[in-house]
C-alpha cells in the first residue's frame, strides 16, 4: 500500500485544465524531497514530465506547473490546455528517482460532447451575461420569436417577443432586435448562474417553416488562483470584475460551508479578526479593486472570493473571482511581538523586519485607520518627513543590512493606541502589523531630564542631564537632536559609566549634553535614550528653547539647583571645534555616520564610538549646531 494518495481517476474534456493534488506522509524528509509527475509507458518506465526541482518537459512547456505545499503535506500538479493525447496513466511521487514512493493516476481527456451540428456554444463565467444570436429568414420576421431551455422531455420557455418571461428569468432576460436588421434577433441573459447552463433553442415562426437554432450555454465557476504565502507575511487579492459592476459595492469573503463570510466590503463592514491588518482599495472605474491583508496567521488559510453587489454581500448571479490561500508555517519572516505595550508619557521602540536582501529599500511606518475602506497614512519614512502632529516624538532609525529598522515613538498618550504597519517599497510580503497598547502610567518614568523647563541663552553654555536607573547601567546612553528627518546622535558623556565602584548609586546615574556656545540653530527637540548594540530601548524628549540674554544681567543656567546635574557641569569643557562643513548631510550613512564628530572629541572617542549614529531617517546627519562638547577627563 503506497503512503502517497491522490485521485485514482481524473476525467476532463479537451481544452480544459486539471489540478491534481497528491498527499504525502507528514515527515521533514518528505516535505523537502523532490516531487515529480511522470507518465507511464508500455515498458513500465515512467518518464518525468515535471518535478519540483524545476524540470519541465517539452510537451508541458507553458501549460503546467507543480507546487509543493509543505505545511499541508501536499503537492499540486496543474495542467492546462488538455488534449486527447494527454489521456494515459501517470504517477505522482516523491524521491530522487521515479522509483520512489508514488501513486497511480489515470487521466482521461474526452472530446467535447457531440452536439447537433448547428449548435452554437457560449462559454461564460458565473455572474456574467450572454447575448445569444438567433438568425431567421425574412418571411418569419412578423412571427413570434422565442428562446426556450431544453429539459428532459420538453423545452421550457425563457422569453418570447410577446413579453412572456419565465419567472426565474424575470429582470435577467431581454429579447431585442438591432437597428433595421430583420434577419436576426437577440436574447440577453444577465447574472448567469450554474443553473442557467444547458441546451437552448431559439425559434422564429411556427410549424415546419419555423427557423430554429440550437445553443449550448456553459456557465463556469471561476478557477481559483492558488496563493502560497508565508506566516506573518502579507497577501494582496487583486480583483478584476469588469466595468459592468464598477459602481457596485465590492467585497471579499471567505468560504465557510455553503456561505461566504464577508471579511471586508466597501460599505464599511469588516470582520473583527482582521482588525488592524486589512485594507480594501478601489483601483479604478473598471471594477478593479484590491484587498491587502498583513500579518497572515495559520487560520487565514482558506478559499476566498471577491465580488460586487449593491448590498456588499455575496449574491448568486453576480461576477466573482476566487483564490485558495495556503499559509506556509516555515516562514522567512521573523517572529516578532505583534503587541507592544507602552505607558502614557513613556516611549516604545518597535523593531520592524524587512527583507535583508533589500537593505537599500525605503522604509516606512504608517498608522492603520479603520474608517471607510481602511487606509494607512505614512507617519515617517526613510525619505518621508515626520507628520507634523508627531513633531519631536517620532523617528525611524535604519540599521542597514541587518534586516531590521527601528521606529521610536515617545511622549505617548492613550490616543496613540492602535495598529501600525511596518512596510518598505521593496518586497511587499514583509509588511507587518503591530498593535500598540498604551496604559496610564502608574510610576515615574525611567528616564528623566533636568532641567525640565529648558531655556538656553544665546552664546552661553547650556547643559542638560538625563537621569537613568541602575537597570540601564550596562546599556549605551545617547542624546540625539530630533528633526523631521530623524534623530541625529550627538556626542555625550555618561557620568555613571566612569565610576569605578561596582555598586550602582541610584542618584548619580546620568548622561549629559552640553551646548557651548548656544546658537539659534540649537533650538528644538532633543532625545535621551538607551540602546544595546542595534536594539533601541526607552527614550525621553525635551524641547530646548533658545532666547537672547536679557541686557545687564549675568545669566546662570537654570539647573533647578539639582545636585546631580551639577556633577556634569563641574567637569572641564573641551571645545571639539567641529567645522560646519564637516557636519553636512552624509548620504546613506553607516551605523557611524558621525564618526568624524566622535573622533574629534579626544580621548573620549573610543568610549563613545559604540553608540555611533543610528542613522537618521534619510541619512542626514544634521546636528543642532557645530558646537557640541564633551565632558572630558
Amino acid at each position: 500500500k503506497s503512503p502517497i494518495f491522490g485521485p485514482q481517476e481524473v476525467s476532463s474534456i479537451e481544452g480544459d485544465s486539471v489540478s491534481i493534488t497528491c498527499y504525502y506522509p507528514d515527515t521533514s524528509v518528505n516535505r523537502h524531497t523532490r516531487k515529480y509527475w511522470c507518465r507511464q509507458g508500455a515498458s513500465g518506465m515512467c518518464t518525468t514530465l515535471i518535478s519540483s526541482n524545476g524540470y519541465l518537459s517539452k510537451e508541458y512547456s507553458g501549460r503546467a506547473n507543480l507546487i509543493n505545499f509543505p505545511e499541508n503535506n501536499t503537492f499540486v500538479i496543474n495542467i492546462e490546455q488538455l488534449t486527447q493525447d494527454d489521456t494515459g496513466s501517470y504517477k505522482c511521487g516523491l524521491g530522487t528517482s521515479n522509483r520512489g514512493l508514488s501513486f497511480d493516476v489515470s487521466l482521461e481527456v474526452s472530446q467535447v460532447p457531440e452536439l447537433p451540428s448547428d449548435t452554437h456554444v457560449y462559454t461564460k463565467d458565473i455572474g456574467r451575461n450572454v447575448t445569444i444570436e438567433c438568425p431567421f429568414k425574412r418571411e418569419n420576421a412578423p412571427s413570434k420569436k422565442s428562446l426556450c431551455k431544453k429539459t428532459n422531455q420538453s423545452c421550457e420557455l425563457v422569453i418570447d417577443s410577446t413579453e412572456k418571461v419565465n419567472p426565474s428569468y424575470i429582470g435577467r432576460a431581454k429579447l431585442f432586435m438591432k437597428g433595421t436588421d430583420l434577419t436576426v434577433f437577440y436574447v440577453n441573459i444577465s447574472h448567469l448562474t450554474h443553473n442557467d447552463a444547458g441546451l437552448y433553442i431559439c425559434q422564429a415562426g411556427e410549424g415546419p417553416s419555423a427557423d430554429k437554432k440550437n445553443v449550448d450555454l456553459q456557465v463556469l465557476a471561476p478557477e481559483p488562483e492558488l496563493l502560497y504565502k508565508d506566516l506573518r507575511s502579507s497577501v494582496t487579492f487583486e480583483c478584476d470584475l469588469g466595468r459592468e459592476v464598477a459602481n457596485e459595492a465590492k467585497y471579499l469573503c471567505r468560504m465557510n460551508k455553503e456561505t461566504c463570510d464577508v471579511i471586508i466590503n466597501t460599505l464599511g463592514k469588516r470582520d473583527p479578526d482582521f482588525e488592524g491588518r486589512i485594507l480594501i482599495t478601489p483601483k479604478d472605474d473598471n471594477g478593479r479593486f484590491s484587498v491587502l491583508i498583513t500579518g497572515l496567521r495559520k487560520e487565514d488559510a482558506g478559499h476566498y472570493q471577491c465580488g460586487a453587489h449593491s448590498s456588499g454581500l455575496p449574491q448568486e448571479g453576480w461576477p466573482i473571482q476566487t483564490w485558495q490561500l495556503f499559509v506556509n508555517e516555515e516562514s522567512t519572516i521573523p517572529n516578532r511581538r505583534s503587541v507592544v505595550k507602552g505607558v502614557t508619557g513613556g516611549s516604545v521602540a518597535i523593531a520592524c523586519p524587512y527583507n535583508p536582501k533589500e537593505s537599500s529599500s525605503l522604509k516606512y511606518w504608517c498608522r492603520w485607520e479603520g474608517d471607510g475602506n481602511g487606509h494607512c497614512p505614512v507617519l515617517v519614512g526613510t525619505q518621508a518627513q515626520v507628520q507634523e502632529e508627531y513633531e519631536g516624538r517620532l523617528a525611524l532609525f535604519d540599521q542597514p543590512g541587518n534586516g531590521t529598522y527601528t521606529v521610536i515613538l515617545n511622549q505617548l498618550t492613550t490616543e496613540d493606541a492602535g495598529f501600525y504597519w511596518c512596510l518598505t517599497n521593496g518586497d511587499s510580503r514583509w509588511r507587518t502589523t503591530i498593535e500598540l497598547q498604551v496604559a496610564e502610567a502608574t510610576r515615574e518614568p525611567n528616564l528623566e531630564v533636568t532641567p525640565q523647563n529648558a531655556t538656553a541663552v544665546l552664546g552661553e553654555t547650556f547643559t542638560v542631564s538625563c537621569h537613568y536607573p541602575c537597570k540601564f547601567y550596562s546599556q549605551e546612553k545617547y542624546w540625539c537632536k530630533w528633526s523631521n528627518k530623524g534623530c541625529h546622535i550627538l556626542p555625550s558623556h555618561d557620568e555613571g559609566a566612569r565610576q569605578s565602584s561596582v555598586s550602582c548609586d541610584q542618584s548619580s546615574q546620568l548622561v549629559s549634553m552640553t551646548l557651548n556656545p548656544v546658537s539659534k540653530e540649537d533650538e528644538g527637540w532633543y532625545w535621551c535614550g538607551v540602546k544595546q548594540g542595534q536594539t533601541y530601548g526607552e527614550t525621553t524628549a525635551i524641547y530646548i528653547a533658545v532666547e537672547e540674554r536679557t541686557r545687564g544681567s549675568s545669566h546662570v543656567n537654570p539647573t533647578d539647583a539639582n545636585a546631580r546635574a551639577k556633577v556634569a557641569l563641574e567637569e572641564e569643557v573641551v571645545d571639539s571645534s567641529i567645522s560646519e562643513k564637516e557636519n553636512k548631510a552624509i548620504p546613506n550613512p553607516g551605523p557611524f555616520a558621525n564618526e568624524r564628530e566622535i573622533q574629534n572629541v579626544g580621548d573620549q572617542a573610543q568610549e563613545n564610538r559604540a553608540s555611533g549614529d543610528a542613522g537618521s531617517a534619510d541619512g542626514q546627519s544634521r546636528s543642532s549646531s557645530s558646537k557640541h562638547h564633551h565632558h572630558h577627563h
Epitope: F5, V10, S11, S12, D16, H194, V219, M255
Partner: nanobody
Framework: EVQLVESGGGLVQAGDSLRLSCAAS????????MGWFRQGPGKEREFVAA??????????YYEDSVKGRFTISRDNAKNTAYLQMNSLKPEDTAVYYC??????????????????WGQGTLVTVSS
C-alpha cells in the same frame, strides 16, 4: 442547506453486487465534493470513495481495499451520487454514509472536510 438521503443498502451474499444512491436536495453548484464513508461494527468511521468536480473536470478517489471493486459516480441532472459495489466481502459489512461539501479543497479522506452527512444505510455481506 443540503439534505442527503442514502438508499440501496441491504443483505447480500459474498461476491454479490449492490448499488448505493445518495440523493442531495438543495443546490449543488459547478464545483463540489461527495464522498462515501463506512462504519463497521465496533470500528471507527473510515473513508471508502470520493468524487470531486469542478466545471467539466471530475476527480475520483478510492480507499486501497476497495480499488477495482467499487466505483463512484454522479448524475449531475439528478443531483445524485452512486457507489457501485462489486465482489462484496464480509469485511465490507458496515453502515455506509454519504457526505457532501460545496467546496473542492481538503483531503477527501478526511471526514472533517465534509459539511453535510446522510443518516446512513446498512450493508450486510454474509459469507
Amino acid at each position: 442547506e443540503v439534505q442527503l438521503v442514502e438508499s440501496g443498502g441491504g443483505l447480500v451474499q459474498a461476491g454479490d453486487s449492490l448499488r448505493l444512491s445518495c440523493a442531495a436536495s438543495g443546490r449543488t453548484g459547478s464545483s463540489g465534493a461527495m464522498g462515501w464513508f463506512r462504519q463497521g461494527p465496533g470500528k471507527e468511521r473510515e473513508f471508502v470513495a470520493a468524487l470531486m468536480w469542478r466545471n467539466t473536470v471530475t476527480y475520483k478517489y478510492y480507499e486501497d481495499s476497495v480499488k477495482g471493486r467499487f466505483t463512484i459516480s454522479r448524475d449531475n441532472a439528478k443531483n445524485t451520487a452512486y457507489l457501485q459495489m462489486n465482489s462484496l466481502k464480509p469485511e465490507d459489512t458496515a453502515v455506509y454514509y454519504c457526505a457532501a461539501d460545496p467546496d473542492t479543497y481538503g483531503d477527501p479522506r478526511n471526514s472533517g472536510a465534509y459539511d453535510y452527512w446522510g443518516q446512513g444505510t446498512l450493508v450486510t455481506v454474509s459469507s
